[in-house]
């Protein structure tokens, strides 16, 4: 069964900085990826960037810089300062199109006592929902 | 119906601050995010940022990054904007829009404008 | 940042006219484009979004197309009530940015 993980992590440079990966274990070919915070994509979350193989990436601030880390892995760097930075328990999900597992999202955030700059191995995260 | 209702005109000295509300209805307040364009005399619009009132999570443009501040409470569906360290550069009519938290695809809903006039 | 070219700046028709108004983007944007009117004195209104849809309430006589980098905005028979200046916008993430207007004025 395809899984879908999330790593959130808060920069030790950057205080207001957080960086999210998210990866796909499965194997299909990935048409889409869609981010975002506040709940799974469409049932609580707002869209923070959308990346697709061909068409390229788009992003909405405070998302900085979204990028393919390898075919079936991105990750995003968010930042802000004040009311646009994100907070320690925001949610940031991730859902995965492949074909032909269909969509998988998972949801994490920052874990509860992590030290700026340290954060728990990517694991996979619970699946929320499979179309 | 949905309705963004904002505050009224306001006249400001340069150095000042000034916050715009922009009262939502008519539809589920969390449900989507708010952005605020700005209006200069005569000119074209400008896009400023948006708030994302269900976490309060926001986004602004490079240009306004360090003196705008968006807020929202939920208990009265109202969102704020607060512009610091004014400009006569900064008069301008202030618009708050309504845009779909997914597709994130237009503002389909706008309020009827805030002039704000920065003036020493 | 994306850039938007609208054209032209300026035009005036006559009533039962077809008018095209043109934005061209700077990089791709994969169709995530909406149109605004813009009336003296009143916020903008949508009309058109992700390039070729018609938002509700928006008369039929109005029509977007276009992909890539290039799209248009047409009005197929002008009315007294279509004056104003529109707006093209693009969603292709943030920053948005706005074309800098077309004004349109009934001859």
């Known amino acids: 069964t395809p899984e879908v993980w999330v790593q959130v992590r808060m920069e030790a440079t950057e205080l207001s900085s957080f960086t999210i990966r998210c990866g796909f274990l499965g194997s299909g070919s990935i048409s889409l990826v869609t981010v975002s915070w506040g709940g799974p994509n469409g049932a609580g979350g707002t869209t923070l960037a959308v990346l697709h193989p061909e068409r390229g990436i788009r992003q909405w601030a405070p998302a900085r810089q979204a990028r393919w880390e390898t075919q079936s892995s991105i990750s995003l760097i968010l930042e802000g300062s004040g009311a646009s930075s994100p907070c320690a328990n925001t949610t940031f999900c991730c859902k995965f199109a492949s074909f032909p597992e269909g969509s998988w999202e998972a949801c994490g955030s920052l874990p509860p006592s992590s030290d700026p700059g340290l954060s728990a191995p990517p694991t996979p995260a619970p699946i929320l929902r499979a179309d | 119906q949905v309705q963004l209702v904002q505050s009224g005109a306001e006249v400001k000295k340069p150095g000042a601050s000034v916050k715009v509300s922009c009262k939502a209805s008519?539809?589920?307040?969390?449900?989507?995010?708010i952005n605020w364009v700005r209006q200069a005399p005569g000119q074209g619009l400008e896009w400023i940022g948006y708030?994302?009132?269900?976490?309060?999570?926001?986004g602004y443009a490079q240009k306004f990054q360090g003196r705008v501040t968006m807020t929202a409470d939920t208990s009265t569906s109202t969102v704020y904007m607060e512009l610091s360290s004014l400009r006569s550069e900064d008069t301008a009519v202030y618009y708050c829009a309504r845009e779909d938290k997914t597709a994130r695809n237009a503002m389909d809903y706008w309020g009827q404008g805030t002039l704000v006039t920065v003036s020493s | 940042d994306i850039q938007m070219t609208q054209s032209p700046s300026s035009l005036s028709a006559s009533v039962g006219d077809r008018v095209t108004i043109t934005c061209r983007v700077s990089?791709?944007?994969?169709?995530?484009l909406a149109w605004y009117q813009q009336k003296p004195g009143k916020a903008p209104k949508l009309l058109v979004y992700?390039?070729?849809n018609l938002a509700e309430g928006v008369p039929s006589r109005f029509s977007g197309s276009g992909s890539g980098t290039d799209y248009t905005l047409t009005i197929s028979s002008l009315q007294p009530e279509d004056f104003g200046t529109y707006y093209c916008q693009h969603f292709w993430g943030t920053p948005y940015t706005f074309g800098q207007g077309t004004k349109l004025e009934i001859k």
């Open positions: 008519g539809y589920t307040f969390t449900d989507y995010n």
């Open positions: 992700e390039a070729t």
């Open positions: 990089e791709n944007i994969y169709s995530n």
């Open positions: 708030i994302y009132p269900y976490i309060g999570g926001s």
